[in-house]
C-alpha cells in the first residue's frame, strides 16, 4: 500500500514538472509573440503612415521642403538626443541654410517659446573647429555665438532665433531632421 | 530578435587601416540605424559613427575625416561598415556594433582593434 502510494506521488510530481515547463514555454512564446507583435505593429505603422498616407513624414514631425523634424518633448544631454534621434532613423538637426535656420526658429515660437534644443554641431576639442555630425563645416553664417567657457565638450544648440554653444553634458531638448519620403504618385 | 555580427578588427600599425563589418540578421525590419561604438580600457563606451537606414551619418569629433561608415545597400541595408584610415595609438579599443530601433537596441560581441608599432 505505502509502496503504491509513494508511486502515484512520483507519478504526481513528475505531471506538476512536466505542467511547469509547458507553462515555462507558454509563457515564452507568448513573451516572443509580444516582442513580434510590437515589430510588426512598428512596421506597419511605419508602412501606413508612409505608403498608404503617402505622408512624406511621420506623425508628429514637421515638413520642410526635403526634410522632416521632430522636436522632442523631453530633455537629454547632447550624446543621448544623438541616439534618441537614431532610434527614430534620424540624426540630429543640421542646419544648411539661414532659410532652414528661420524655418527652425520659426516653427519653435509656435510650439514651445523660448527653450533650449540641441542640434547636430559640435566642438572640436583639438583644432577648435566647428563641425556638423556628418562632418562637414557650418557655412560662416551658421556658427554659435561664442558663449561657453566650458573644460569640457562644447556643442551646439538653437534658441530664439540664434546658435549658441553650451557643455554637451547640460539638459536640452533637441531635435531630430530626416529626409522627407518623396511622394510615388 | 536581431543578430550581429562582427568581424575585421585586428593589430595595424600606426598611420594604417582597417576595415570593420557588422552583419544584421533576425527581425532587420525593427532597425532604423546602425552604429559603431568603442571603448578602451578604464575609459567611456562612446559612439564612433552611425548610419540611418536613409544613409544619414554621425561621427564622433576624434574620428571626422580619418573614418567612413557606410552600408550595403545590396544586401538589404543590413550590412554596415567602418573604414578606418590614418589609425592613431588612442584608436585602440574593443569596437562593438549596435543597432537602433523605436523599441529596442541590440548589441554585438565586439572585435578587439590595436594600434602599435
Known amino acids: 500500500k505505502l509502496l503504491q502510494v509513494s508511486t502515484i506521488a512520483m507519478q504526481q510530481q513528475e505531471k506538476l514538472i512536466q505542467q511547469e515547463r509547458a507553462l515555462l514555454n507558454f509563457t515564452e512564446w507568448k513573451r516572443s509573440c509580444a516582442l513580434q507583435m510590437k515589430y510588426c505593429q512598428a512596421f506597419m505603422q511605419n508602412s501606413l503612415s508612409s505608403a498608404h498616407n503617402s505622408s512624406p513624414c511621420p506623425n508628429n514631425w514637421i515638413q520642410n521642403r526635403e526634410s522632416c523634424y521632430y522636436v522632442s518633448e523631453i530633455w537629454s544631454i547632447w550624446h543621448t538626443s544623438q541616439e534618441n534621434c537614431l532610434k527614430e532613423g534620424s540624426t540630429l538637426l543640421q542646419i544648411e541654410s539661414k532659410e532652414e535656420m528661420d524655418f527652425i526658429t520659426g516653427s519653435l515660437r509656435k510650439i514651445k517659446g523660448s527653450y533650449d534644443y540641441w542640434v547636430g554641431l559640435s566642438q572640436d576639442g583639438h583644432s577648435g573647429r566647428w563641425l556638423w555630425q556628418d562632418g562637414s563645416s557650418p557655412s560662416p553664417g551658421l556658427l554659435p555665438a561664442e558663449r561657453s567657457q566650458s573644460a569640457n565638450q562644447v556643442c551646439g544648440y538653437v534658441k530664439s532665433n540664434s546658435l549658441l554653444s553650451s557643455n554637451c553634458s547640460t539638459w536640452k531638448y533637441f531635435i531630430c531632421e530626416k529626409y522627407a519620403l518623396r511622394s510615388s504618385v | 530578435q536581431v543578430q550581429l555580427q562582427e568581424s575585421g578588427g585586428g593589430l595595424v600599425q600606426p598611420g594604417g587601416s582597417l576595415r570593420l563589418s557588422c552583419a544584421a540578421s533576425?527581425?532587420?525590419?525593427?532597425?532604423?540605424?546602425m552604429g559603431w561604438y568603442r571603448q578602451a580600457p578604464g575609459k567611456q563606451r562612446e559612439l564612433v559613427a552611425a548610419i540611418t537606414d536613409q544613409g544619414r551619418t554621425t561621427y564622433a569629433d576624434s574620428v571626422k575625416g580619418r573614418f567612413t561608415i557606410s552600408r550595403d545597400d545590396a544586401k538589404n541595408k543590413n550590412t554596415v561598415y567602418l573604414q578606418m584610415n590614418s589609425l592613431k595609438a588612442e584608436d585602440t579599443a574593443v569596437y562593438a556594433c549596435?543597432?537602433?530601433?523605436?523599441?529596442?537596441?541590440?548589441w554585438g560581441q565586439g572585435t578587439q582593434v590595436t594600434v602599435s608599432s
Open positions: 549596435k543597432a537602433f530601433g523605436r523599441f529596442d537596441d541590440y
Open positions: 533576425g527581425s532587420i525590419v525593427s532597425i532604423n540605424s
